[in-house]
Interface confidence: low
């Protein structure tokens, strides 16, 4: 069917369309193009013969109509009065006509729209504004952009005369924003540029910075004030009711208590003509003296003395706080506080309460801190510590020995040798020993201040052959896969060779096995059932050599798994059920028994006489290592046949 | 006549450093406690720092722990204020005063220190 497409459907002014053709039939004698919705030879606009290829303008030729071989038709520059309905009228070969209809529609370019306002500054709460979208243009669709978002939905808001105007009821500060209108019709669309509203507004309630009221005096006072108000507002300043200056700023120097009072800004907008208020009382208090702090006691002695510590000066309605170590007290009932905090009191001294200790006054506005105090607390002397810790010696060595004891003050040492004064130092000192510088060598450390002493003796020996060793265990009764052991070899001598031997053999190379101290101590990481064996330390040097008495390690290992004997699980009726559990353990495992779940006895062996079907179920072993903490189970089913019913059942015990 | 001018102000991206310096006259300064306080824009005083007259115990902010150093020169009559790790929470008048804090004694006129990116 024959068909016209107009290319486009809405044409701006000045540009062309294309009323393109399709299903053009063959064999054709010519075609002629109208405008209008029928064949009017009045409204013709051209004729075209295909014979004579001759193209034939009508009445309604303009002359900016193309007229093509495949009978589409071009109007170039278009104009508003094109809008409407063009029809082709074919006449075919046979002279058989046919027509077709189409139509576009012609809309002008829109020109660059403008806003125009009926009051250029609303007031806040008070006006309206009317903005109205310029020129009015027919056919054409006007649009509103807030901040070039789309309007908001608001009971304030409101578009008339065909969306042309946009009316803002009771402007709010919020309202100041950039307005844009748009036109659009189908060819075009333009933007006008933005109007900002300016809405007049406050001043509101204003705000004094800053918040504080109260002051020292000698400060300077420098108080500020803002009112949100547009325009800006302008400031005034009263004190106790008093007109001081029109500034925003309120400034005075090395305030004294007299300056107290209550201070007053007014804020005005002369274009709104309100104004607000705010008053704020400042106070001015008088310069509180730096606190210190006084002791009862410079030198209290551990364990003995208290001390009680005073915050200074002492001034009424006034908020004392401490702290030690640079924090806040801690909980303590050896720290007591009196009713007013002035005081706080240590019980019972001990050498960390040293401190530093701080006191500090509270008041209106800050706290003022004292310097830190420290605590001279006496203490010790604790028991003196001999080193080294060699208690053998070979004949021709130097004998140095070297004692401390913690104290304060420090200790005053004095050395004694089986009971008999020596020298009042801290280090002893004997060249060239013999056999009878054998005996009991004693430091008493004294501390002068708190008149206490403290002893300790070591027994040196000075022999050319070594004494027999002996092995000390820190674990005499390790627990298998957990713990470890430590053997050490004693006595810790000078030039002595160490050696250990397990079984009779020498140590075997094992990543559990460590030696450390010179060799003198052995460690087995991880202890398992096979290091329960005879362990024997020696020791040596260039003239003699010695072994210990073999140790033997107690490895506290298992219950393992138990295995129930005999294996049978078929019995005869009126046989014997003799069950004896064994498990692997050291020390020996608890045994318990349970058939079906129910608790039985505490035996080893579990014996139950003429057995019978009743007795069919599950037979459970129990072991548990007190020492290890270790438990273990098995379950054997046993199933009583009837006499005679199945060949091959056990006769039983 | 009690003069502290404070110094080392300025203008520093987060993270960055500062060190305020204090040069103070007309008292006594090896032997009053010195502490630093700030007023951040449209606050109050904050307490900042304390340090006593020999300088061998010194306080701090929790805002400002581990970040801060207050030290004295007693020989110079300057008090030093060494800002690492600065934040934007930072930005103040910063000013060193006599005595344990706000208000306590004379303050100078400050240094303005501004964190911002």
């Known amino acids: 069917k024959l068909t016209i497409e107009s290319t486009p459907f809405n044409v701006a002014e000045g540009k062309e369309v294309l009323l393109l053709v399709h299903n053009l039939p063959q064999h054709l004698f010519g075609y002629s193009w109208y405008k209008g919705e029928r064949v009017d030879g009045n409204r013709q606009i051209i004729g075209y013969v295909i014979g004579t290829q001759q193209a034939t303008p009508g009445p309604a030729y303009s002359g900016r109509e193309i007229i093509y071989p495949n009978a589409s038709l071009l109007i170039q520059n278009i104009i508003q009065n094109d809008t409407g309905f063009y029809t082709l009228h074919v006449i075919k070969s046979d002279l058989v006509n046919e027509e077709a209809t189409g139509q576009f529609r012609v809309y002008p370019e829109l020109p660059k729209p403008s806003i125009s306002s009926n009051n250029s500054k609303p007031v806040e709460d008070k006006d309206a504004v009317a903005f109205t979208c310029e020129p009015e243009t027919q056919d054409a669709t006007y649009l509103w952009w807030v901040n070039n978002q789309s309007l908001p939905v608001s009971p304030r808001l409101q578009l008339s005369n065909g969306n042309r105007t946009l009316t803002l009821f009771n402007v709010t500060r919020n309202d100041t924003a950039s307005y844009k209108c748009e036109t659009q019709n189908p060819v075009s669309a333009r933007r006008s540029d933005s109007v900002i509203l300016n809405v007049l507004y406050g001043p509101d309630a204003p705000t004094i910075s800053p918040l504080n009221t109260s002051y020292r005096s000698g400060e300077n006072l420098n108080l500020s004030c803002h009112a949100a108000s547009n325009p800006p507002a302008q400031y005034s300043w009263f004190v106790n009711g008093t007109f001081q200056q029109s500034t925003q700023e309120l400034f005075i120097p090395n305030i004294t208590v007299n300056n107290s009072g209550s201070y007053t800004c007014q804020a005005h907008n002369s274009d709104t003509g309100l104004n607000r208020t705010t008053v704020t009382t400042i106070t001015v208090y008088a310069e509180p003296p730096k606190p210190f702090i006084t002791s009862n006691n410079s030198n209290p002695v551990e364990d003995e003395d208290a001390v009680a510590l005073t915050c200074e000066p002492e001034i009424q309605n006034t908020t004392y706080l401490w702290w030690v170590n640079n924090q806040s007290l801690p909980v303590s009932p050896r720290l007591q506080l009196s009713n007013d905090n002035r005081t706080l009191t240590l019980l019972s001294v001990t050498r960390n309460d040293v401190g530093p200790y701080e006191c500090g006054i509270q008041n209106e506005l800050s706290v003022d801190h004292s310097d830190p105090v420290i605590l001279n607390v006496l203490y010790g002397p604790d028991d003196p510590t001999i080193s080294p810790s060699y208690t053998y010696y070979r004949p021709g060595v130097n004998l140095s020995l070297s004692c401390h004891a913690a104290s304060n003050p420090p200790a005053q040492y004095s050395w004694l040798i089986d009971g008999n004064i020596q020298q009042h130092t801290q280090e002893l000192f004997i060249s060239n020993i013999t056999e009878k510088n054998s005996g009991l060598y004693t430091c008493q450390a004294n501390n002068s201040a708190s008149g206490h002493s403290r002893t300790t003796v070591k027994t040196i020996t000075v022999s050319a052959e070594l004494p027999k060793p002996s092995i000390s265990s820190n674990n005499s009764k390790p627990v298998e896969d957990k713990d470890a052991v430590a053997f050490t070899c004693e006595p810790e001598a000078q030039n002595t060779t160490y050696l250990w031997w397990v079984n009779g053999q020498s140590l075997p190379v094992s990543p559990r096995l460590q030696l450390s101290n010179g060799n003198r101590t052995l460690t087995l990481f991880n202890v398992t059932r096979n290091d329960a064996r005879a362990y024997v330390c020696g020791i040596q040097n260039s003239v003699s050599a010695n072994r210990s008495d073999p140790v033997t390690l107690d490895v506290l290992y298992g219950p393992d798994t138990p295995i129930i004997s005999p294996p049978d699980s078929s019995y005869l009726s009126g046989a014997n059920l003799n069950l004896s559990c064994h498990s692997a353990s050291n020390p020996s495992p608890q045994y318990s028994w349970r058939i079906n779940g129910i608790p039985q006895q505490h035996t080893q062996v579990l014996f139950i006489a003429k057995i019978t079907p009743n007795n069919n179920g599950t037979y459970a072993c129990f072991v548990s290592n007190l020492a290890t903490g270790r438990n273990n189970s098995i379950v054997k089913s046993i199933t009583v046949s009837a006499s005679g019913t199945s060949p091959g059942l056990s006769a039983g015990a | 006549q009690v003069q502290l001018v404070e110094s080392g102000g300025g203008l520093v991206q987060p993270g960055g450093s500062l060190r305020l310096s204090c040069a103070a006259s007309?008292?006594?300064?090896?032997?009053?406690?010195m502490s630093w306080v700030r007023q951040a824009p449209g606050k109050g005083l904050e307490w900042v720092s304390g340090i006593n007259t020999d300088g061998s115990f010194t306080r701090y902010a929790d805002s400002v722990k581990g970040r801060f150093t207050i030290s004295r020169d007693n020989a110079k009559n300057t008090l030093y204020l060494q800002m690492n790790s600065l934040k934007s929470e930072d930005t103040a008048l910063y000013y060193c005063?006599?005595?344990?804090?706000?208000?306590?004694?004379?303050r100078g006129q400050g240094t303005l220190v501004t964190v911002s990116s």
């Open positions: 005063a006599v005595g344990g804090g706000l208000g306590y004694g004379p």
């Open positions: 007309g008292f006594t300064f090896s032997s009053s406690y």
